[in-house]
């Protein structure tokens, strides 16, 4: 079953390579277990950036080595991606799955274009 997922169209990463955006889904049921996946689309290639499964009301738990962190509040997920560089500029798509209990729902956002600008190196000071 399809589910609507909303996310901002454009986000500019900070000078430290950190980008945050909200992924909001229109939950048609009373899910207790939700999975959120961030996908990156660049040059028609789609790769998984990170994924987390969480119980409603609990924190998102990404893998220890993940570049993502996040918090949840109701039907909103606040996602933060760290360690971004200019080459990571691309479309970041939020995929939400209501896993348990059934029925299963899948929603895919239109994507957030994240622009990353590498900071200029500091000039040498004598």
């Amino acid at each position: 079953k399809a589910m609507h997922v909303a996310q901002p169209a454009v986000v500019l990463a900070s000078s430290r390579g950190i980008a945050s955006f909200v992924c909001e889904y229109a939950s048609p049921g009373k899910a207790t277990e939700v999975r959120v996946t961030v996908l990156r689309q660049a040059d028609s290639q789609v790769t998984e950036v990170c994924a987390a499964t969480y119980m409603m009301g609990n924190e998102l738990t990404f893998l220890d080595d993940s570049i993502c962190t996040g918090t949840s509040s109701g039907n909103q997920v606040n996602l933060t991606i760290q360690g971004l560089r200019a080459m990571d500029t691309g479309l970041y798509i939020c995929k939400v799955e209501l896993m348990y209990p059934p029925p299963y729902y899948l929603g895919i956002g239109n994507g957030t274009q994240i622009y990353v600008i590498d900071p200029e190196p500091c000039p040498d000071s004598d």
């Epitope: 079953k1 207790t32 277990e33 999975r35 996946t37 994924a51 995929k95 799955e97 896993m99 348990y100 209990p101 059934p102 029925p103 299963y104 899948l106």
Partner: antibody
Framework: QVQLVQSGAEVKKPGSSVKVSCKAS?????????WGWIRQAPGQGLEWIGA???????YYSPSLKSRVTITADKSTSTAYMELSSLRSEDTAVYYC????????????WGQGTLVTVSS | DIQLTQSPSSLSASVGDRVTITCRAS??????LAWYQQKPGKAPKLLIY???NRATGIPSRFSGSGSGTDFTLTISSLQPEDFATYYC?????????FGQGTKVEIK
């Protein structure tokens, strides 16, 4: 009619890996269903291993998560379950099963694949 | 994990008997419970899903009831082909879990 046909019996050494396949026919695997894997040790009950959804997402039993990988090839309507670092207690019949997305009970099952782990 | 406990573990009955098997969950699973029948050397067969809905092609002598933590599978009039092992399964939470099984034998 719906059919799930699994690969044949395997005999494996402890520490090795096994990959069991499950080919579906008679329905569209890309919508409305997920694939579950369940095992049954000799004379024992049923144990859920994990599942794969049409979105590509996988779910695993916490007790097997570090050793199991479930994949699916949509082009051939085939699911795979790979279990690594095999030990004698992994000896069991491994079943694949179809689960509707509206309820996660398993309405069609494969014939089962006996995996024997022995030195 | 949600534990499912079936009772009895085994029972002896005669053809025509009314048989009742219970399944108790360690926490509420609402109505997200299924029942299966398994015969030796065969894959399980789905009988009931969502606690009380009969699966396609299952005879009306099989019925399921219950919600929350207590569930029942009833066979109203046992037939020769019903001698088998029966399992309950919850799918309210991950990981999916099964009961330990109830073996129905011929008296």
């Amino acid at each position: 009619q719906v059919q799930l046909v699994q690969s044949g019996a395997e005999v494996k050494k402890p520490g090795s890996s096994v990959k069991v396949s499950c080919k579906a026919s008679g329905y569209s695997i890309t919508s409305g269903y997920h694939w579950g894997w369940i095992r049954q040790a000799p004379g024992q009950g049923l144990e859920w291993i994990g599942a794969i959804y049409h979105s590509g997402s996988t779910y695993y039993s916490p007790s097997l998560k570090s050793r199991v990988t479930i994949t699916a090839d949509k082009s051939t309507s085939t699911a795979y379950m790979e279990l690594s670092s095999l030990r004698s207690e992994d000896t069991a019949v491994y079943y694949c099963a179809r689960g509707p997305l509206s309820y996660y009970a398993f309405d069609y099952w494969g014939q089962g694949t006996l995996v024997t782990v022995s030195s | 994990d949600i534990q499912l406990t079936q009772s009895p573990s085994s029972l002896s009955a005669s053809v025509g008997d009314r048989v009742t098997i219970t399944c108790r969950a360690s926490q509420s699973v609402s109505r997200y419970l299924a029942w299966y029948q398994q015969k030796p050397g065969k894959a399980p067969k789905l009988l009931i899903y969502d606690a009380s809905n009969r699966a396609t092609g299952i005879p009306s002598r099989f019925s399921g009831s219950g919600s929350g933590t207590d569930f029942t599978l009833t066979i109203s009039s046992l037939q020769p082909e019903d001698f088998a092992t029966y399992y309950c399964q919850q799918y309210y939470r991950s990981p999916i879990t099964f009961g330990q099984g109830t073996k129905v034998e011929i008296k």
